[in-house]
């Protein structure tokens, strides 16, 4: 599932290159392993911002699929309470390209620990 999430992120990156989206997104660029589920939640919430900003059906579908895949992969530990982690709003705001690069990085963390 996580490998498919990366494929979807690459697809989103390709799709948004043909658009002009100026959004800045809360981005965790240095994820601590003990906060990775919290960080993933922030990435997924911000991904919905991209979908709404784009107004593009392909991006919308890809974001939904990515969320479905991530949800299923995290169904066993998605409700784990991680303490001492930053709230989404406390994260640095970055452009979409940097956001997606950081997203791929956190997904790779999940792949490496699964």
């Amino acid at each position: 599932n996580w490998v498919n999430v990366i494929s979807d992120l690459k697809k989103i990156e390709d799709l948004i290159q043909s658009m002009h989206i100026d959004a800045t997104l809360y981005t965790e660029s240095d994820v601590h392993p003990s906060c990775k589920v919290t960080a993933m939640k922030c990435f997924l919430l911000e991904l919905q911002v991209i979908s709404l900003e784009s107004g593009d059906a392909s991006i919308h579908d890809t974001v939904e699929n990515l969320i479905i895949l991530a949800n299923n992969s995290l169904s066993s530990n998605g409700n784990v309470t991680e303490s001492g982690c930053k709230e989404c709003e406390e994260l640095e705001e970055k452009n979409i390209k940097e956001f997606l690069q950081s997203f791929v990085h956190i997904v790779q963390m999940f792949i490496n620990t699964s």
Epitope: V37, M40, K41, L44, L45, Q48, S51, L52, A57, S58, H60, D61, T62, V63, E64, N65, I67, I68, A70, N71, N72, L74, S75, G78, N79
Partner: antibody
Framework: EVRLMASGGGLVQPGGSLRLSCAAS????????MSWVRQAPGKGLEWVAT????????YYPDSVKGRFTISRDNSKNTLYLQMNSLRAEDTAVYYC???????????????WGQGTLVTVSS | DVVMTQSPLSLPVTLGQPASISCRSS???????????LEWYQQRPGQSPRLLIY???NRFSGVPDRFSGSGSGTDFTLKISRVEAEDVGVYYC?????????FGQGTKLEIK
């Protein structure tokens, strides 16, 4: 008023195939994901398949995966369910349903068609 | 897979009296983004299912306010404040937080 009209049901032998259709009207079909749900005689509801707005993504339970294929033709406002290798336990009324989008407020099947009966028997 | 268990399976109610249906999931259906995708559907005799409640407590348009949903995590409830004759049918809870999406077995509401 949203309208969904399922058709294509009938009697088919075990191992056979059938294609169901669902004609949609009174809404912008391409703006919604769609699902099929079935109900065996006298039994409860079972989710069968879901397809994304553009048709690129499909989802199934293990009970039908590899045998059933959901697809759509947005130019014809029509949803399909291709059912192969049919079994007696696939006998049911099949409903098509419109699925509200996650991005626009959460998932739910907000409108349902009237259903079409599929009977698998020799 | 998430198993949805409803109780009671049969619910005889006097007209004008309240009714309550419970739905329990085998694991939490709160998704990673903090949302709970739990719906309630009504199926009147001989009819197609109809959406009543989505995301635990949101009433769908046109649904009378005597219907209400509540709950969190793994325990959910559908309440009818005063049962009317048109409420007869089978009620299903449904989760679509995780694939495969799953229904409860259904609760048959009948008039005493």
């Amino acid at each position: 008023e949203v309208r969904l009209m399922a058709s294509g049901g009938g009697l088919v032998q075990p191992g056979g195939s059938l294609r169901l259709s669902c004609a949609a009207s009174e809404f912008t079909f391409s703006n919604y994901a769609m699902s099929w749900v079935r109900q065996a005689p006298g039994k409860g509801l079972e989710w069968v398949a879901t397809i994304s707005r553009g048709g690129d993504y499909t989802y199934y339970p293990d009970s039908v995966k590899g045998r059933f294929t959901i697809s759509r033709d947005n130019s014809k406002n029509t949803l399909y369910l291709q059912m192969n290798s049919l079994r007696a336990e696939d006998t049911a009324v099949y409903y098509c349903a419109r699925r509200v989008s996650l991005i626009t407020g959460g998932w739910a099947m907000d409108y349902w068609g009237q259903g079409t009966l599929v009977t698998v028997s020799s | 897979d998430v198993v949805m268990t409803q109780s009671p399976l049969s619910l005889p109610v006097t007209l004008g009296q309240p009714a309550s249906i419970s739905c329990r999931s085998s694991q939490s259906i709160v998704d990673i983004t903090g949302n709970t995708y739990l719906e309630w559907y009504q199926q009147r005799p001989g009819q197609s299912p109809r959406l009543l409640i989505y995301k635990v407590f949101n009433r769908f348009s046109g649904v009378p306010d005597r219907f209400s949903g509540s709950g969190s995590g793994t325990d959910f409830t559908l309440k009818i404040s005063r049962v009317e004759a048109e409420d007869v049918g089978v009620y299903y809870c449904f989760q679509d937080s995780f694939v495969p999406y799953t229904f409860g077995q259904g609760t048959k509401l009948e008039i005493k």
